[in-house]
């Protein structure tokens, strides 16, 4: 058993039918010694008396808010949550496996630049009685600070018969060094509590591996005289790290016909312009990627050829 | 070429070669991004590689003030990786494919380090840890980790030379 926060405790249980459970001793936070009784949740049934209460925690029915009273007055509370360990593996019932980029990916994170700011998100089908708390650091043995905000519900989707809820959180490294080569990964820890079930999820990454620039901005076409060719130009996204002579991007320019089956013409360039042939009913798209490190491409910025 | 005593390197040449290094490092092991090699307990293997750290002056401001600190750090790293790529880790079993970019990568590391440091001038270099994995699969894992680490190192070096070529070239 360990303390998650004040008056909230997590009991770690080997989880299988007929498991012996864990013996837990609760102590009433009071100088009083006599006349103390204990109850669980909203029930008025007295579970025991005395300054301490010893319980055998086996299932969710044994978890909940234990309260000690004296003469009708509440003295203190202890909320017991359960953390299930099935066959040596901690349960992951609360969050959905996003399976990208690999199985057992519950948290996904992205950064728009090298400033040390990043966003993580996760999915669940649970709509109520759900709380998240997020902590982060750079490195684990001698951790350096990363400050995370509160997790918020960022999207709701219908998937078949189920509703899916996306939560996200923004974090910022306290003393980020955008130009340095990271040697210690960022660690992100999410505590999830659903009713009386506790679970924790972690992710470990380098900012460089989660970079995904915003799409190029101000995408424009300039027809070239007496030619089917056009000059496409664009700019670095505002959110990208500066100076651009240091934090450089490379670009992919694509000409795509109306039909998905039509052959795509692609050009790669380090410049912020390119000359391409504009076909009727086609569209021109540009996306960006770090020039020197193969992290994710941005989403496409597009304009119609017409 | 860099000249001892603080004069500038051939920024444009260094830029071109460092960008080529980036391409080679990724073609040598493109899928490494999809393997979580940190799960494989690499503390004792790749923690000793020289990293370009915050105080090494490789940021735009640091380069403007005095690029020599940063260039020395990059040189140190290039020599370190050049030695690793020429070691038993890469030459032993399992053998690299004949068309593997590792050979080119090795040569380019050497080329860039020579651009930064002419003969007769010696910056101090970092000692290579003695890594001699016994099993072929351990060697393979170590190669992946070294290439992964090299990808990060050459990315920073390429940024430095690109910025230098754009803003510090005579």
């Amino acid at each position: 058993i360990w303390e998650l926060k004040k008056d909230v405790y997590v009991v770690e249980l080997d989880w299988y039918p007929d498991a012996p459970g864990e013996m837990v001793v609760l102590t009433c936070d009071t100088p009083e010694e006599d006349g103390i009784t204990w109850t669980l949740d909203q029930s008025s049934e007295v579970l025991g008396s005395g300054k301490t209460l010893t319980i055998q925690v086996k299932e969710f029915g044994d978890a909940g808010q234990y309260t000690c009273h004296k003469g009708g007055e509440v003295l203190s509370h202890s909320l017991l949550l359960l953390h299930k360990k099935e066959d040596g593996i901690w349960s992951t019932d609360i969050l959905k496996d996003q399976k990208e980029p690999k199985n057992k990916t519950f948290l996904r994170c992205e950064a728009k630049n090298y400033s040390g700011r990043f966003t993580c998100w996760w999915l669940t089908t649970i709509s109520t009685d759900l709380t998240f708390s997020v902590k982060s650091s750079r490195g684990s043995s001698d951790p350096q600070g990363v400050t995370c905000g509160a997790a918020t519900l960022s999207a709701e989707r219908v998937r078949g018969d189920n509703k899916e809820y996306e939560y996200s959180v923004e974090c910022q490294e306290d003393s980020a060094c955008p130009a340095a080569e990271e040697s210690l990964p960022i660690e992100v820890m999410v505590d999830a509590v659903h009713k009386l079930k506790y679970e924790n999820y972690t992710s470990s990454f380098f900012i460089r591996d989660i970079i995904k620039p915003d799409p190029p901005k101000n995408l424009q076409l300039k027809p070239l005289k007496n030619s089917r060719q056009v000059e496409v130009s664009w700019e670095y996204p505002d959110t990208w790290s500066t100076p651009h002579s240091y934090f450089s991007l490379t670009f992919c320019v694509q000409v795509q016909g109306k039909s998905k089956r039509e052959k795509k013409d692609r050009v790669f360039t380090d410049k912020t312009s390119a000359t391409v042939i504009c076909r009727k009913n086609a569209s021109i798209s540009v996306r960006a990627q770090d020039r020197y490190y193969s992290s994710s491409w941005s989403e496409w910025a597009s304009v119609p050829c017409s | 070429r860099a000249v001892p005593g603080g004069s500038s390197p051939a920024w444009t040449q260094c830029q071109q070669l460092s960008q080529k290094l980036c391409t080679l490092a990724w073609s040598a092991h493109p899928l490494v991004g999809h393997m979580d090699l940190r799960e494989e307990g690499d503390e004792e293997t790749t923690n000793d590689v020289p990293h370009i750290q915050c105080g090494d002056g490789c940021d735009p401001q640091g380069l403007r003030d005095n690029s020599q600190f940063c260039l020395q750090r990059i040189h140190q790293g290039l020599i370190f990786y050049e030695k690793l790529l020429g070691s038993d880790i890469f030459t032993g079993e399992p053998s690299l494919l004949p068309d593997s970019p590792v050979g080119q990568l090795h040569a380019s590391l050497l080329g860039l380090s020579q651009l930064l440091q002419p003969e007769g001038h010696h910056w101090e270099t970092q000692q290579i840890p003695s890594l001699s994995p016994s099993q072929p699969w351990q060697r393979l894992l170590l190669r992946f980790k070294i290439l992964r680490s090299l990808q990060a190192f050459v990315a920073v070096a390429a940024r430095v030379f690109a910025h230098g070529a754009a803003t510090l070239s005579p």
């Epitope: 989880w15 299988y16 039918p17 007929d18 299932e59 969710f60 029915g61 099935e86 066959d87 040596g88 593996i89 019932d93 496996d97 089908t125 | -």
Partner: antibody, heavy 116, light 107 residues
């Protein structure tokens, strides 16, 4: 005492369907993950499928993916295995068991024979 | 998929003797390994999980050891009721895979 009782096995033609049930008692069924494991006559054991306590997450062996569906009704304390497009190689004794990884408690099994 | 290989295929011993059964994984499964006993016409019974933890109600003569790729089930002194087929199973990564079994028969 934990008890698991399978039913629904029998003889079925190739391409046919069958639904196996497993009635659980002696424990709080809705709290625990469950699995199906099968054993071809005179052969070894093969994990078939598993389902989490809430029914929200399921896993299948490649050999049955797309043909078998595991489900549960926590109000009835029952685990199910819907088997479609049955093949001769699906002939086996099918056991239901508690757990997703380690099969701690087993039923006595029900025999499924796929033959024309 | 992770392949599990048990040896020997058959082991002939007498009551009172010590039995040593081996199980090898094609790649590391850490300590995520279980052993089961199966008697003719019966469902398997869990003996050991986590490579070395005895399941509820399993006699102390059964012990498991090993980690990574090589595992051993030891029965210190065979009782007549121990003659059965023994299976190992990894649960480090899906799909959970079983060994082909070792038949422990009376000499």
């Amino acid at each position: 005492e934990v008890q698991l009782l399978e039913s629904g096995g029998g003889l079925v033609q190739p391409g046919g369907s069958l639904r196996l049930s497993c009635a659980a008692s002696g424990f709080t069924f809705s709290n625990y993950s469950m699995s199906w494991v099968r054993q071809a006559p005179g052969k070894g054991l093969e994990w078939v499928s598993s389902i989490r306590s809430s029914g929200g997450r399921t896993d299948y062996a490649d050999s049955v993916k797309g043909r078998f569906t595991i489900s549960r009704d926590n109000s009835k304390n029952t685990l199910y295995l819907q088997m479609n497009s049955l093949r001769a190689e699906d002939t086996a004794v099918y056991y239901c068991a508690t757990g997703i990884a380690v099969a701690r408690y087993w039923g006595q099994g029900t025999l499924v024979t796929v033959s024309s | 998929d992770i392949q599990m290989t048990q040896s020997p295929g058959t082991l002939s011993l007498s009551p009172g003797e010590r039995a040593t059964l081996s199980c090898r994984a094609s790649q590391s499964v850490s300590s995520y390994l279980a052993w089961y006993q199966q008697k003719p016409g019966q469902a398997p019974r869990l003996l050991i999980y986590g490579a070395s933890n005895r399941a509820t109600g399993i006699p102390a003569r059964f012990s498991g050891s090993g980690s990574g790729t090589d595992f051993t089930l030891t029965i210190s002194s065979l009782e007549p009721e121990d003659f059965a087929v023994y299976f190992c199973q990894q649960y480090a990564s899906p799909p959970r895979t079983f060994g082909q079994g070792t038949k422990l028969e009376m000499k």
